[in-house]
């Protein structure tokens, strides 16, 4: 059967900080999360079966006032759809994707959501990962941060 | 074989001016840009087989300040997905997406991504285009500016 | 045959106002918009056939002075889009996107998309629609507002 | 909306100056790029100068370089023309505009580039 997954953002475990990081706590297995023939494991969901895949992520972040100042007012809000080859140890970004944003302070509350898509071959044992700027300030729910991969077809 | 293209932007031939502009030059075949079953060809995409095709685009805009100054700052950030049958001459726009942003001086970089995406029919020998404002402002990495099909299923 | 739909704003019916509503005019079948083994009604994508599915939406927000003064220059322009079930009624967002704007009266022109996708479980009776805050300032091209679904594998 | 009116305009012999003054009200006058245009009696309106939001780039035609200088005082939200070694041929209407949306300068040598535009001055070259 066609593999396929959609991960949604495990809000417990979500890193803090403003740098550009990994996110490695992902739902796979309650919600709208599900995986079939893809194996999630150390953050990163790994390609059990050769193929072109459709790979997508929609990442959203937001601020309340509530939560205290932001450190800056400008911020980067990006994501990076990573792929790993653990045969060539090297990591490529196959998509990203976000915007530089002026939150002021005149507004008690600031949202902003990136999506990104793309068609790519990957390979058995190959790792896709997602990383962002400004975790702390991702939105939690499993309908704003996720990312997924669905096979499509194989290679000839 | 279910026909796809993945198309990376071709950094070395990026049009100037400023209004809606016409890309012509993308990769099809070195890193993540890649081609089955469809026709790059005078900077549009051909379709060789009837069918339903899922379209996406993605588009990044960036600039920084040793760039030299903007005209403006207040900007149109704008891609356009269009289809152009050739047997009957006629371009329509499938997709649209963007923003006009406020890249203020008072900040060194700015950057902004638009993400398109959509199921439609196309016939043999029709063509899809991507057409931007601004170009000069475009994000040249593979991983940045993009787009792509993949056949879904053959029309009824 | 593989189920799909392709639905684009009827913007001779969208409510005015700028809370959080339920968009239910949709065309299906003139332009780019089409439907196979689906049904529309009541203003909601009904599912026929159980299946993991393909879920997008792409949705444009537009101003023009001409149009009169903004009530107010900081928005919330967002979308969701969700699933009922009519045998347990229940609602849940599968997919939001947006951005808080801030459409300052110094510019004449303020545009803004929202582009979502994502990999769902749809069984059939379950109903697909799609609410936006801020109406009132939907662009209605057809290329510009849009949503659809498409098949991609039966559930195992 | 942007309301643009240009003063300074005259009358001038072959080889004096001018200064044109164009005044900006309404919107944020420095987010804009800024242009001059000119139209000769029986002529197409024509390209003269143009200039970023900031005032640190400037544009101008080919028929005016080292003659004209295009410049803008934010402050003030005003923009200037100072001409000199004027000749017959410089004869003509004088109409600023203000234009955004593009990033690229040169764009703005094209009259679609601007979205507002004043009622112009007369400058009268006499040889």
């Known amino acids: 059967a066609q593999p396929f997954a959609h991960l949604t953002i495990n809000a417990t475990n979500i890193p803090t900080g403003s740098h550009k990081v990994s996110l490695s706590s992902w739902y796979h297995d309650r919600g709208w999360a599900k995986i079939s023939n893809m194996t999630f494991s150390n953050g990163k969901l790994i390609v059990n079966q050769d193929g072109f895949y459709y790979l997508y992520a929609n990442i959203c972040f937001r601020h309340h006032e509530t939560s205290g100042d932001l450190a800056t007012e400008y911020l980067q809000l990006m994501v990076y759809v990573t792929k790993t080859s653990i045969k060539i140890p090297s990591s490529h970004t196959l998509m990203k994707g976000g915007s530089t944003k002026y939150w002021s302070g005149n507004s008690e509350f600031h949202f902003y959501s990136i999506n990104v898509g793309g068609f790519f071959k990957l390979r058995s044992g190959e790792e896709i990962s997602v990383e962002v700027s400004n975790p702390s300030l991702l939105d939690p729910d499993q309908d704003a941060t996720y990312f997924g991969a669905f096979k499509v077809r194989d290679i000839d | 074989a279910q026909p796809f293209a993945h198309l990376t932007i071709n950094a070395t031939n990026i049009p100037t001016g400023s209004h809606k502009v016409s890309l012509s030059s993308w990769y099809h075949d070195r890193g993540w840009a890649k081609i089955s079953n469809m026709t790059f060809s005078n900077g549009k995409l051909i379709v060789n087989q009837d069918g339903f095709y899922y379209l996406y685009a993605n588009i990044c805009f960036r600039h920084h300040e040793t760039s030299g100054d903007l005209a403006t700052e207040y900007l149109q950030l704008m891609v356009y997905v269009t289809k152009t049958s050739i047997k009957i001459p006629s371009s329509h726009t499938l997709m649209k997406g963007g923003s006009t942003k406020y890249w203020s001086g008072n900040s060194e970089f700015h950057f902004y991504s638009i993400n398109v995406g959509g199921f439609f029919k196309l016939r043999s020998g029709e063509e899809i285009s991507v057409e931007v404002s601004n170009p000069s402002l475009l994000d040249p990495d593979q991983d940045a500016t993009y787009f792509g099909a993949f056949k879904v299923r053959d029309i009824d | 045959a593989q189920p799909f739909a392709h639905l684009t704003i009827n913007a001779t019916n969208i409510p005015t106002g700028s809370h959080k509503v339920s968009l239910s005019s949709w065309y299906h079948d003139r332009g780019w918009a089409k439907i196979s083994n689906m049904t529309f009604s009541n203003g909601k994508l009904i599912v026929n056939q159980d299946g993991f599915y393909y879920l997008y939406a792409n949705i444009c927000f537009r101003h023009h002075e001409t149009s009169g003064d903004l009530a107010t220059e900081y928005l919330q322009l967002m979308v969701y889009v969700t699933k009922t079930s009519i045998k347990i009624p229940s609602s849940h967002t599968l997919m939001k996107g947006g951005s808080t704007k801030y459409w300052s009266g110094n510019s004449e022109f303020h545009f803004y998309s929202i582009n979502v996708g994502g990999f769902f479980k749809l069984r059939s009776g379950e109903e697909i629609s799609v609410e936006v805050s801020n109406p009132s300032l939907l662009d209605p091209d057809q290329d510009a507002t849009y949503f659809g679904a498409f098949k991609v594998r039966d559930i195992d | 909306e942007v309301q643009l009116v240009e003063s300074g305009g005259g009358l001038v012999q072959a080889g004096g100056s001018l200064r044109l003054t164009c005044a900006a009200s309404g919107r944020t006058f420095r987010s804009y790029a800024m242009g001059w245009f000119r139209q000769a009696p029986g002529k197409e309106r024509e390209f003269v100068a143009a200039?970023?939001?900031?005032?640190?780039?400037?544009n101008y035609a080919d028929s005016v370089k080292g003659r004209f200088t295009i410049s803008r005082d934010n402050a003030k939200n005003t923009l200037y023309l100072q001409m000199n070694s004027l000749e017959p041929e410089d004869t003509a209407v004088y109409y600023c505009?203000?234009?955004?949306?593009?990033?690229?300068?040169?764009?703005?040598?094209?009259?679609?580039?601007?979205?507002?535009w004043g009622q112009g001055t007369q400058v009268t070259v006499s040889s």
């Open positions: 505009a203000a234009g955004s949306g593009y990033a690229s300068l040169s764009y703005y040598s094209t009259e679609r580039a601007y979205t507002y």
């Open positions: 200039i970023n939001y900031s005032g640190g780039s400037t």
